[in-house]
């Protein structure tokens, strides 16, 4: 994902009839004007803000990469939700790209978990039942998997 968020520039709005501690904030879907007096809407499909804020700019919407599908579009209050295509997954330690799921387990192991958009297939040793972090499966004996379909946000 190319998360093109603008730096969340913040400011303190001028003190004018502050009836509440949060009067200088704008609602989700907006950002504050430079003089701190007005709230300006984010542009639908282009940028967004998710919380009450004093940002000078809304955050730019994420564009889903090739190899990803768009689960839900960007609105003025929520970023795009992207998900890895079927047969690929995104790991927590390498969230920048979708990796191909393994097609099966190494010899002596059985598959206990399917490929999902956020996890590779899960293999355990037949006897001990311990998990295998595993690289490539052994050529001789593989158990094929069917890709899973649950949704996972990756913004």
């Amino acid at each position: 994902i190319t998360q093109q968020d603008l730096a969340p520039q913040q400011r303190v709005a001028p003190q004018q009839k502050r009836s509440s501690p949060s009067e200088g904030l704008c609602p989700p879907g907006h950002h504050i004007s430079e003089d701190g007096r007005d709230c300006i809407s984010c542009k639908y499909g282009q940028d967004y803000s998710t919380h009450w804020n004093d940002l000078l700019f809304c955050l730019r919407c994420t564009r889903c990469d090739s190899g990803e599908v768009e689960l839900s579009p960007c609105t003025t209050t929520r970023n795009t939700v992207c998900q890895c295509e079927e047969g690929t997954f995104r790991e927590e330690d390498s969230p920048e790209m979708c990796r191909k799921c393994r097609t099966g387990c190494p010899r002596g192991m059985v598959k206990v978990g399917d490929c999902t958009p956020w996890s590779d297939i899960e293999c355990v040793h037949k006897e001990s039942g311990t998990k295998h972090s595993g690289e490539a499966p052994a050529v001789e004996e593989t158990v094929t998997s069917s890709p899973g379909t649950p949704a996972s946000p990756c913004s």
Partner: antibody, heavy 119, light 107 residues
Framework: QVQLVQSGAEVKKPGASVKVSCKAS????????LHWVRQAPGQGLEWMGW????????KYNEKFKDRVTITADKSTSTVYMELSSLRSEDTAVYYC????????????WGQGTLVTVSS | DIQMTQSPSFLSASVGDRVTITCRAS??????VAWYQQKPGKAPKLLIY???TRHTGVPSRFSGSGSGTDFTLTISSLQPEDIATYYC?????????FGGGTKLEIK
């Protein structure tokens, strides 16, 4: 169902103040912004300000800033709009209206409260 | 403040007619425009937001279009129950402002 029920009509003298209430029901009070919009007889609509019960955020239209005060009682899910130093041109129907925490359009409106300012 | 200029102010049309109301903003408001219908003695009702998105329960004969400064509300086939005053509103920058209204009458 969502309801915004406003207080009854008021007749006030110039220079006086008026306080109009708007009781919300049918939704979670702290999740929506409540606004006040007024409409003078035969005229268009004019946004006055908002109150967000979720964080007590208040914003006023600069035009009314010195004369309007918006408050709320969360225990009764009621928002109030007080307008002071009334003049004849403040004669109008005052509406409360609701908006989700996003784009500033109003999906539900109260029935309106007629405030007449006359000596 | 952004001025919203509606035209025409009054419009007379027959049942079944295609009716178009326009709204011009004094500066660019992107697509942040809503349309409301108001019947005499009643509160306004939301019809359209984000210039072209119909609110829940609004008949498909109502449609909106436009971006930047020029916006249009269209009723594809006028029905007797559509007799009302219609208002545009910009929700781009506070203070949010409304057009002066278009009163729609049956010929």
């Amino acid at each position: 169902q969502v309801q915004l029920v406003q207080s009854g009509a008021e007749v006030k003298k110039p220079g006086a103040s008026v306080k109009v209430s708007c009781k919300a029901s049918g939704y979670t009070f702290t999740e929506y912004i409540l606004h006040w919009v007024r409409q003078a007889p035969g005229q268009g609509l004019e946004w006055m300000g908002w109150f967000y019960p979720g964080n007590n955020n208040i914003k006023y239209n600069e035009k009314f800033k010195d004369r309007v005060t918006i408050t709320a009682d969360k225990s009764t899910s009621t928002v109030y709009m007080e307008l002071s130093s009334l003049r004849s041109e403040d004669t109008a129907v005052y509406y409360c209206a609701r908006h989700e925490q996003g784009p500033g359009y109003f999906d539900y409106w109260g029935q309106g409260t007629l405030v007449t300012v006359s000596s | 403040d952004i001025q919203m200029t509606q035209s025409p102010s009054f419009l007379s049309a027959s049942v079944g007619d295609r009716v178009t109301i326009t709204c011009r903003a004094s500066q660019d408001v992107n697509t942040a425009v809503a349309w409301y219908q108001q019947k005499p003695g009643k509160a306004p009702k939301l019809l359209i937001y984000w210039a072209s998105t119909r609110h829940t329960g609004v008949p498909s004969r109502f449609s909106g279009s436009g971006s930047g400064t020029d916006f249009t509300l269209t009723i594809s086939s006028l029905q007797p129950e559509d007799i009302a005053t219609y208002y545009c509103q910009q929700h781009y920058i506070t203070p949010w402002t409304f057009g002066g209204g278009t009163k729609l009458e049956i010929k």
